[in-house]
Interface confidence: low
């Protein structure tokens, strides 16, 4: 189990998300050229893409990927069964839900099949690499003459996600943003009925079930209020 | 048996203070009474002197430590007793097994300030005081604005269902004096209640520029 260790007052010890180990570099032969770094993301805990920059190779090379889970029941080395390609060269691997074990150390190994000594291993904490789908079904409820409540849904365990709400009016230069915990609702307690408001939300797998840094895509925006009748330079910049 | 109706209510501020109110019909005003706190799993105990706040009610604050120290958790149970002196002896008037994180009332928000004011809007910020780190972001707020010619009781409540320590008040009248208050509540606790209202913050909107509608 890979964990973030916290002392009782909430101070975190630093933990790294991956480790790179390459073969020793005595001379710069092909076998000692560094392999590209593998980047993995777990999409909504439905599938995982592990990708690398295939164009960083000196010549087009179909690198192979193996993976396993360290110190667990799933520690048997597995071959990638579903490669992703970039211009007919392997550039990634897709793993399906049944192959994803969020709370075990995921070990990924990239290898040059023509130079078997040329390999690099990384250890990843998958719970820190989850990217949820964008929030859906944004709805606005009028609580009173001047108050709005924004609600949304996520296709995931709600308590695992935190959210970022952004809103702006047709008179604003920039978005106003506010973080929201797992409750997936946001109150705007004072609105101006003469302005048109736009809201959008994104979500992140943090902090209760993981420590992911990456946010989901933004939701589709939702609007409220009337278009301002006054001439307004920002009116058409809402989606910028 | 204790004569008359007795009511003993206490709240924990989530850090190092338990505030109690005891009311007793027909109690003697000049009786000396105390609240004793005995936690079930801590080495300390604490006492405070009940002081009259009305004809038949007394209040006191149990100071458990420095203001920001975390003295209790959700597994603690504190036995609270009201003890009154009767001659040379102490008599127990009320008792309760107090679960601190089921009976929360935070301190009123502090440091209210105007961040930015215009003719029709005003941005105000505040800070929470002595709130446990256990809450993380699991807090909500209510706010109200006092307009000229109205009372606080008439002011509509504004709800913030998220931990947001600022507000942008819209549709204000230019060149007008307002007051603003905010209060806070944790999500946790069956008997948890709102904090007292903050000290009011007075502010004035900017006057409208002549010949312009801002």
């Amino acid at each position: 189990l890979n964990t973030t260790i916290l002392t009782p007052n909430g101070n975190e010890d630093a933990t790294t998300d991956f480790f790179l180990t390459s073969m020793p570099t005595d001379s710069l032969s092909v076998s000692t050229l560094p392999l590209p770094e593998v980047q993995c993301f777990v999409f909504n805990v439905e599938y995982m893409n592990c990708t690398w920059n295939s164009s960083s190779e000196p010549q087009p090379t179909n690198l192979t990927l193996h993976y396993w889970y360290k110190n667990s029941d799933n520690d048997k080395v597995q071959k990638c069964s579903h490669y992703l390609f970039s211009e007919e060269i392997t550039s990634g691997c897709q793993l399906q839900k049944k192959e994803i074990h969020l709370y075990q150390t995921f070990v990924v190994q990239l290898q040059d099949p023509r130079e078997p000594r040329r390999q690099a291993t990384q250890m990843l904490k998958l719970q820190n690499l989850v990217i949820p789908w964008a929030p859906e079904n944004l709805t606005l409820r009028k609580l009173s003459e001047s108050q709005l409540e924004l609600n949304w849904n996520n296709r995931f365990l709600n308590h695992c996600l935190e959210h970022l709400v952004q809103y702006r009016t047709d008179w604003d230069h920039s978005w106003t943003e506010q973080s929201v915990d797992y409750r997936h609702k946001f109150s705007l307690p004072s609105v101006d009925g003469q302005k048109r408001y736009t809201f959008r939300v994104r979500s992140r797998f943090n902090p209760l079930c993981g420590s992911a840094q990456h946010w989901s895509e933004w939701s589709h925006p939702i609007h409220w209020g009337s278009n301002s009748s006054k001439e307004n330079p920002f009116l058409f910049a809402l989606e910028a | 048996a204790v004569n008359g109706t007795s009511r003993f209510t206490c709240f924990y501020n989530s850090r190092a203070n338990i505030s109690c109110v005891w009311s007793q019909d027909g109690a003697l005003q000049d009786t000396s009474c105390q609240v004793h706190a005995w936690p079930d799993r801590r080495r300390w105990n604490q006492t405070c002197e009940l002081l009259p706040v009305s004809q038949a009610s007394w209040a006191c604050n149990l100071i458990l430590g420095t203001p920001d120290s975390q003295k209790l958790t959700a597994v603690d149970i504190v036995t609270l007793r009201v003890m009154c002196r009767e001659g040379v002896r102490w008599r127990m008037m009320a008792i309760q097994d107090f679960k601190p994180f089921e009976n929360l009332r935070l301190m009123a928000p502090i440091s209210l300030q105007v961040v930015h004011v215009e003719t029709h809007r005003c941005n105000i910020s505040w800070k929470i005081s002595q709130a446990s780190h256990y809450f993380e972001r699991h807090l909500e707020f209510e706010a109200r604005t006092l307009s000229p010619g109205h009372t606080w009781e008439e002011a509509p409540l504004m709800t913030l269902k998220q931990k947001q320590e600022w507000i942008c008040l819209e549709t204000l009248t230019p060149d007008t004096q307002y007051e603003f208050q905010v209060r806070v509540k944790p999500l946790q606790g069956e008997f948890t209640t709102w904090s007292p209202w903050s000290q009011p913050l007075a502010f004035r909107t900017k006057p409208a520029a002549l010949g312009k509608d801002t």
Epitope: T4, P8, H159, C160, L208, S211 | T73, A74, V75
Partner: nanobody, 119 residues
């Protein structure tokens, strides 16, 4: 109703190991943070360790860090505490407690299991 039953305690020599278990029932186990807390003879309650509902975030008291490992099996509604390099000062009644996202030390706890570390 909520029930937490600890087991696995006993007498062990200094430097030895024990594994405590906690069987939970009466609530949706994988919705809750869980903790281990302990009480040494004649002393106050000491919080030992805490694990989030999914097992992704773990807290340890400084006194046990590096020696104790908390884990959970949500499928079997079970919480575990693996204890290595036990010392005399680890002698205590160990309780399993149900927590939540707000208060890590919980709202319900079991009857406890006694761990005695002595030569």
């Amino acid at each position: 109703q909520v029930q937490l039953v600890e087991s696995g305690g006993g007498l062990v020599k200094p430097g030895g190991s024990l594994r405590l278990s906690c069987a939970a029932s009466g609530f949706t186990f994988n919705d809750y943070y869980m903790s281990w807390i302990r009480q040494a003879p004649g002393k106050g309650l000491e919080w030992v360790s805490h694990i989030s509902s999914s097992g992704s975030t773990i807290y340890y008291a400084d006194s046990v860090k590096g020696r104790f490992t908390v884990s959970r099996d949500n499928a079997n509604n079970s919480l575990y505490l693996q204890m290595h390099s036990l010392r005399a000062e680890d002698t205590a009644v160990y309780y399993c407690a149900r927590g939540d996202a707000v208060s890590i030390t919980g709202d319900y706890r079991g009857q406890g299991t006694l761990v005695t570390v002595s030569s």
